[in-house]
Interface confidence: low
Amino acid sequence: GAPEGGQPYPVLRVAHSAPVGAQLATELSIAEGQEVLFGVFVTGKDGGPGVGPNSVVCAFPIDLLDTLIDEGVERCCESPVHPGLRRGLDFFQSPSFCPNPPGLEALSPNTSCRHFPLLVSSSFSRVDLFNGLLGPVQVTALYVTRLDNVTVAHMGTMDGRILQVELVRSLNYLLYVSNFSLGDSGQPVQRDVSRLGDHLLFASGDQVFQVPIQGPGCRHFLTCGRCLRAWHFMGCGWCGNMCGQQKECPGSWQQDHCPPKLTEFHPHSGPLRGSTRLTLCGSNFYLHPSGLVPEGTHQVTVGQSPCRPLPKDSSKLRPVPRKDFVEEFECELEPLGTQAVGPTNVSLTVTNMPPGKHFRVDGTSVLRGFSFMEPVLIAVQPLFGPRAGGTCLTLEGQSLSVGTSRAVLVNGTECLLARVSEGQLLCATPPGATVASVPLSLQVGGAQVPGSWTFQYREDPVVLSISPNCGYINSHITICGQHLTSAWHLVLSFHDGLRAVESRCERQLPEQQLCRLPEYVVRDPQGWVAGNLSARGDGAAGFTLPGFRFLPPPHPPSANLVPLKPEEHAIKFEYIGLGAVADCVGINVTVGGESCQHEFRGDMVVCPLPPSLQLGQDGAPLQVCVDGECHILGRVVRPGPDGVPQST
Amino acid sequence: EDWQCPRTPYAASRDFDVKYVVPSFSAGGLVQAMVTYEGDRNESAVFVAIRNRLHVLGPDLKSVQSLATGPAGDPGCQTCAACGPGPHGPPGDTDTKVLVLDPALPALVSCGSSLQGRCFLHDLEPQGTAVHLAAPACLFSAHHNRPDDCPDCVASPLGTRVTVVEQGQASYFYVASSLDAAVAASFSPRSVSIRRLKADASGFAPGFVALSVLPKHLVSYSIEYVHSFHTGAFVYFLTVQPASVTDDPSALHTRLARLSATEPELGDYRELVLDCRFAP
């Protein structure tokens, strides 16, 4: 009876006492049929929640209540009495200490301690039978009945619903007989409930409702399995496609078997030639937790083709979570020669199953949506790569993702699949033994996809040098080496110690490739970032140039006229960042097509005019070429004395 | 590829939005009390009280009889008329506070908020599978009742719970009422009492045993009686009340009060605190 931990729910909202069924009696450690007081408690008068559920239900066995009261009387009235133990009930009587009667100093010989009202000093503590599962529900009415060996709480709620729930402590979900709305008014169900025969009477607003003790019906059970697992007293049976009581569908009502129910399957397509491992999902497949299927009981057909049941892989067996149910069934589909391409049905028939605890499985379930398809391989690229492997092959075609298995074989060795889609497969080639042309094939579902393809293993590319040792976004890099064209693309990557960026080189010569630096943002426009610049060809060994300087790109000024004073023989213009990249890329400055021996002073470029240069009436164009990319910055003109341009 | 079936939530096997239509009765006003009767000869009834009216329904929830229980002072009040002519108290609506069966007779007893909380006894008359109420008897003897001692003042307008117990040939009414200072001053109902129904159905025997909230606590200490029942040798009341007479009156807890069902006395009145918790 001592208080335990947990959140107190001190305010009783409704109560009812009733004898309990065998199962709950066992859980409460009392005898079946013993009277138990059930109370719905809330946290306060307003019933508003703190944390935790709105309503909780506690069970107090009457015999235990009486024992606690009798023990409390003993503590008050039998020697030795604990000093300071109060009789209590000070709102009814004068305060006093045990064993004295109210208001008196001490007992007189003709009065007994037991003959006066008493508040027992200890409380009777219990925890929520429903483990908080009533959640937001605010219970406003309660009546408890025993049905067979089951104890059922019939509860009315604040929003005008009736919940009929088995009272059981050991579960972490609610076992509902029913949960339904009394009407559309949504008014609270009132506290007092009465029983009349096999019905309970609940009041809500100005209405009285008569609810069968065994529940209002079975239509809220949506699946045959759930229907036939319902309590016997509910009288539920399966009526072909709904759960009902016998009077609702006397012609089709039965309680002995459920058909299997297919809800989903995977995959939704398979190859016309070759096998597919089909996974069927649903319920009422075998009713055995181990997933064992008795011989010859389950027949799966897809279109005209049989699907051979497979034993369940024990490593893949997963416990079905408390609030979920799903069954899986696997079979191997090998299409018949007569099977046609196109959409078809998946059908599961279960027969001759031994009866389960609640029913046996018997019947057929059909689901549309499987398609037989013919994979077609249209293109493969590249058809060559280094002996080291690692070439990313792209196979293009149709229906390449059908079924459950596919393999790209290069000279009989699997090419590791990186990506699979309906129209494209990506895989990385395995290493080759020698430089040679070898067969390349695609298998789907173990059957070869038509088409004859050859892959050429070439000598591994060898990178010997990378130059220059600096650059900026998209600036050119030269790679020198041997067999550089063996790879479909050389990949250039820059790594700053934190992240890497990559670009692909266009194929040119076996000994030399011209590449562009990848996109990389140098945050500080005045600075640069040092890192490693690497070049590699597919799976072959690469080459790394350490200490590569990645610079911000130079910014050309806007184009305009460049006027010269009479005494000037050199042009000065600003070109931010150009001086910094002068060691990394080729820079050429021309005026009127003639090259000038430019020099840098910070961000200023000084270009001495060539002696042979003739500036005409319109001047001459000033052009700067950086890494092969040319910009006309303006026209060089020499104004006359009155400011009008004139020729020299 | 290791594809797994998506799990189906357990809740997907049930639909609690399915509409069920169950038999119902429209009482014409907010239902204040309801009690059922099942006789030995397959006769049964449902009694439904609303303000100023008592409905008698058959087992099919069809109306069999309807009785006006108020307003007090209104010439149409059928129960009031059973107390004879003359004004019996201030006029006003009758809200039914007690509706119980006395299984010994058998009879229905109803007590309301008007006429000092007095009760009326309606003998049950079986008619086939249905039941009718005989003319009501007024359980009030004017010469026995005073404002400071009123054995026939049973119902409190603040709420009353009654359990009827047969002891020998007599019916004892175990009554628990919520009080405040104003209610206590008017024909002095008690918090807890045991009253014997007089054999001539003229009211309750005087000199009944009772406990009441002491006058000094009436303002701050209110007891709500939530439920009462009889099992074995005891009658039990369930209350919600302040945890202490001295501390914050809004700090409530729940108690069970136990009374002897075999001896109509209150010396062995016991209370026990019921503690219900949620342990996540």
Epitope: F180, S181, P321 | Q4, R7, D15, D17
Partner: antibody, heavy 116, light 108 residues
Framework: EVKLEQSGGGLVQPGGSRKLSCAAS????????MHWVRQAPEKGLEWVAY????????YYADTVKGRFTISRDNPKNTLFLQMTSLRSEDTAIYYC?????????WGQGTTLTVSS | DIVLTQTPSSMYAFLGERVTIICKAS??????LNWVQQKPGKAPKTLIY???RLADGVPSRFSGSGSGQDYSLTISSLEYEDMGIYYC??????????FGSGTKLEIK
Amino acid sequence: EVKLEQSGGGLVQPGGSRKLSCAASGFTFSSFGMHWVRQAPEKGLEWVAYISGGSGTFYYADTVKGRFTISRDNPKNTLFLQMTSLRSEDTAIYYCARSTTVLDYWGQGTTLTVSS
Amino acid sequence: DIVLTQTPSSMYAFLGERVTIICKASQDINNYLNWVQQKPGKAPKTLIYHADRLADGVPSRFSGSGSGQDYSLTISSLEYEDMGIYYCLQYDDFPPFTFGSGTKLEIK
């Protein structure tokens, strides 16, 4: 075309009340559960409440339990969120979203500001 | 309650780049995971449900994968319109349904 049109936002004082609405069209409203999700300024998404198609099941986040009530009027294809005892931390954009677990369509959002 | 931890909290990526966002659950959530996109100033939009199923009208460059506690959203080739915040959402154990804290994706 599935559409969820929201209304009812605005400025409310702390301790005040407000009712948000979400009018649905383009699908069978009573067949789908509905959610409310909110987003406080410069914060992430926070789930608030859920109600099933026929109002038989509802869930609330602990932060709003006892203060907010989710309801729906199926004949009028409308979802509601009644908010009481509002606090400054309830300031957010409130979105309604369709379906039980797969929140496949979302409303445009309505802004609630709780401030004195 | 189940906690979803998203990484990174923000990232920059180039157009055309392959982008992957990670979502880790505090316990096994049995593939009951959605990915939701929210573009600046707009309402959220569901991209992926049940960990790897593409929602209606979502471009095929988006894909989801994972199992147990670890899930990822991949954009195979980033486009400008993919800029926004991406949230994961679990519905294995509820209430409550819980969202990840979000990953802000910006274009370099």
